[in-house]
Interface confidence: low
């Protein structure tokens, strides 16, 4: 999708419907691209992203990607079309109202990704065991 700092028209004339025929509004998502983060070892965290973007296309959903390697931790927040893979992964949870992090296999780093379809839902990313058992030691997170 188009980052919010790029001047690009939002096409509100495009009508996109869900399976029930209901009209989908272009979504509001946090959209800070990749930022360094202190999000580690907590149950959930806020994105600390001050940019709320209106997604370019009505079908796009909110996405958050948390990555940790030997050097740093980053959090990426974007809009993305769930029909297309992101970081080579399918957005399996795009219909979820909450951004529930799931671990993905990436060599050399710890990689979690979530997607969701309620306004600004990628502002609060959730690693909690009640939602995700793939990494019970990872607890939710607050950005400083």
């Amino acid at each position: 999708t188009i980052p919010p700092h790029v001047q690009k028209s939002v096409n509100n004339d495009m009508i996109v419907t869900d399976n029930n025929g209901a009209v989908k509004f272009p979504q509001l998502c946090k959209f800070c691209d990749v930022r360094f983060s202190t999000c580690d070892n907590q149950k959930s965290c806020m994105s600390n992203c001050s940019i709320t973007s209106i997604c370019e296309k009505p079908q796009e959903v909110c996405v958050a990607v948390w990555r940790k390697n030997d050097e740093n931790i980053t959090l990426e927040t974007v809009c993305h079309d769930p029909k297309l893979p992101y970081h080579d992964f399918i957005l399996e949870d795009a219909a979820s109202p909450k951004c529930i992090m799931k671990e993905k296999k990436k060599p050399g780093e710890t990689f979690f990704m979530c997607s969701c379809s309620s306004d600004e839902c990628n502002d609060n990313i959730i690693f909690s065991e009640e939602y995700n058992t793939s990494n019970p030691d990872l607890l939710l997170v607050i950005f400083q």
């Epitope: 001047q7 025929g21 509001l28 973007s53 306004d119």
Partner: antibody, heavy 116, light 107 residues
């Protein structure tokens, strides 16, 4: 946090003019369609008009009661929406809200009173 | 312009009651219908969009249904903070139009 803050309301005589402003922050204002909605004292909500994005021509639409008297403009560099109201009538007395095109976010409203 | 008619215009209910508000459009609007809640002196708050989609952060006791010309907002178990005025609004065509409102009061 998304914020919409209206200003410029006040008392004006019939036939007079007033310009309302709406300062936007916390979202990509340039990508947003913006609307004005008003509410007369003790009455329901009435859509006033909208402006589309500058990139799509900044086209405006208006409700019949204000067409030809009101204009909407935007300054994307200042993240500000404007409502210019001319030839005001007593029936234009209302709280005026700016909204992120009838979405989740609305301002707190500003009161316009048209009276002699 | 499309006319939106709400009923009832007001109702009295008690905490815990199930409350239903209806909205009828003068012509078919598919599912292009939103519901707002407004409290005195405050801006409207979006509850339901696209007839049945719950806005983020809105309690699940609120639900919307309908398509075409007839729509319903249901509050499954009325809470003290739900006493307010509710408006339907169509976004099918310009100008967007609102219903006249339904005031939910304490019995």
């Amino acid at each position: 946090q998304v914020q919409l803050v209206e200003s410029g309301g006040g008392l004006v005589e019939p036939g007079g003019s007033l310009r309302l402003s709406c300062a936007a922050s916390g979202f990509t204002f340039a990508n947003a369609w913006m609307s004005w909605v008003r509410q007369a004292p003790g009455k329901g909500l009435e859509w006033v008009g909208r402006i589309k994005t500058t990139y799509s021509g900044g086209a405006t639409d208006f409700a019949a009661p204000v067409k030809g008297r009101f204009t909407i403009s935007r300054d994307d560099s200042k993240n500000t929406l404007y409502l210019q109201m001319n030839s005001l009538k007593t029936e234009d007395t209302a709280v005026y809200y700016c909204t992120l095109d009838l979405r989740k976010y609305w301002g707190q409203g500003t009161l316009v009173t048209v009276s002699s | 312009d499309i006319q939106m008619t709400q009923s009832p215009s007001s109702l009295s209910a008690s905490v815990g009651d199930r409350v239903t508000i209806t909205c009828r459009a003068s012509q078919s609007i598919s599912s292009y219908l939103n519901w707002y809640q407004q409290k005195p002196g405050k801006a409207p708050k979006l509850l339901i969009y696209a007839a049945s989609s719950l806005q983020s952060g809105v309690p699940s006791r609120f639900s919307g249904s309908g398509s075409g010309t007839d729509f319903t907002l249901t509050i499954s178990s009325l809470q003290p903070e739900d006493f307010a005025t509710y408006y339907c609004q169509q976004s099918y065509s310009t100008p967007p139009t609102f219903g006249q409102g339904t005031k939910v009061e304490i019995k």
